[in-house]
């Protein structure tokens, strides 16, 4: 009876996500059969989040809207480990929008989810950011420095990275 009600709850939760994500990939967390964490297929997972590389080229605003339609945001990078995971799925000859912008052109960078911007946990290429007109951040590859962040014009279309919390059922 308990298992039946748990299954019903799971099914209703899955139905909730079905409008955005017709397919979920779930894994059992720990040893308890009752704890499953899911990411939409074909998103990738790292720690408690799911990631999607959007290869469509769009402005920063449209990229963020595209992520939000899927129940996500442009990626907020909190640690070096998280960035190291993300770059495994990126192409060296492409640039990808992050969820980081400087809306007023005042060098007051902010994350889309209101995570405090911490100068000590940033991965800007050397000499970046460097332009008041470039109010949005991308991650890209430079042969001299590997992967890092750069500020660019927000209206210039780029690929992007979406991030959402894992779905627990």
């Amino acid at each position: 009876n308990f298992m039946y009600s748990k299954t019903v709850k799971r099914l209703s939760k899955l139905r909730e996500y079905q409008q955005y994500h017709p397919s979920l990939t779930c894994v059992m967390e720990g040893k308890d059969i009752e704890d499953w964490s899911c990411c939409p297929t074909p998103w990738t997972s790292f720690q408690s989040s799911c990631y999607f590389i959007s290869t469509g080229m769009q402005s920063w605003t449209k990229s963020q809207k595209n992520c939000s339609v899927m129940g996500a945001d442009l990626v907020v990078i909190n640690t070096r480990e998280e960035q190291d995971f993300i770059i495994q799925n990126l192409k060296r000859n492409s640039s990808y929008f992050l969820g980081l912008s400087d809306p007023g052109g005042r060098r007051h960078w902010q994350w889309v989810d209101q995570t405090p911007y911490n100068e000590n946990v940033t991965f800007w290429h050397s000499g970046e950011p460097n332009n008041l007109d470039e109010r949005c951040a991308i991650i890209n590859f430079r042969s001299s420095e590997e992967w890092g962040w750069n500020d660019i014009h927000c209206h210039v279309p780029q690929k992007s990275i979406c991030k959402m919390k894992k779905i627990y059922i």
Epitope: G105, N130, N131, D133, H153
Partner: antibody, heavy 118, light 107 residues
Framework: QVQLQQSGAEVVKPGASVKISCKGS????????MHWVRQAPGQGLEWIGV????????NYNQKFKGKVTMTVDKSSSTAYMELSRLTSDDTAVYYC???????????WGQGTLVTVSS | DIQMTQSTSSLSASLGDRVTITCQAS??????LNWYQQKPDGTVKLLIY???NLHTGVPSRFSGSGSGTDYSLTISNLQQEDIATYYC?????????FGGGTKLEIK
């Protein structure tokens, strides 16, 4: 080549306003913000503020807030700066300068002399 | 606001001399230091950006160096056309601020 052409010298009365212009050419106007810089007679350069030619928003030096209004006309690739409630202290050469990489002003207009005199 | 100090307001040198102009910031400006030349007719030109990078068309006799709070501009072989006032400017923090200028004259 990049050029910033400023309007001519102005003589204005105390308490009046003046609007000076800066027309950009030789580049995509809306890709580069426009800075304004003041130089009082015999003095050094002083940063007034910057306006985004794309978004239209401005960042002012606190010292000039309430004194200066910056605007942009994208259709004519022209930036404007209006100075209000003029006093003799506002007598100066006013420069426009294009924003560049590495927080720099890479090209400058020739300057506009504003003289406030009764 | 960050204060920029050019301790020498005027400098006299001979043609062919090596001339160094210094600039000090009131706090670390992370190399966001630029140099401008203002000719006697009022024309202003960018010479050097981000401490040591030569702007397009600027002769190689001009060079810049420094870090943290201390920066300098060097003219290695002074020419007649270099007679001007030189200003440093920090772009690290708004509002951007300039040094008071160093006027270069010929002996």
């Amino acid at each position: 080549q990049v050029q910033l052409q400023q309007s001519g010298a102005e003589v204005v009365k105390p308490g009046a306003s003046v609007k000076i212009s800066c027309k950009g050419s030789g580049y995509t106007f809306t890709d580069y913000s426009m800075h304004w810089v003041r130089q009082a007679p015999g003095q050094g350069l002083e940063w007034i503020g910057v306006i985004s030619t794309y978004y239209g928003d401005s960042n002012y030096n606190q010292k000039f807030k309430g004194k200066v209004t910056m605007t942009v006309d994208k259709s004519s690739s022209t930036a404007y700066m209006e100075l209000s409630r003029l006093t003799s202290d506002d007598t100066a050469v006013y420069y426009c300068a294009r924003n560049g990489n590495f927080y720099v002003m890479d090209y400058w207009g020739q300057g506009t002399l504003v003289t406030v005199s009764s | 606001d960050i204060q920029m100090t050019q301790s020498t307001s005027s400098l006299s040198a001979s043609l062919g001399d090596r001339v160094t102009i210094t600039c000090q910031a009131s706090q670390d400006i992370s190399n966001y230091l630029n140099w401008y030349q203002q000719k006697p007719d009022g024309t202003v030109k960018l010479l050097i950006y981000y401490t040591s990078n030569l702007h397009t068309g600027v002769p190689s006799r001009f060079s810049g160096s420094g870090s943290g709070t201390d920066y300098s501009l060097t003219i290695s072989n002074l020419q007649q056309e270099d007679i001007a006032t030189y200003y440093c400017q920090q772009g690290n923090t708004l509002p951007w601020t300039f040094g008071g200028g160093t006027k270069l004259e010929i002996k």
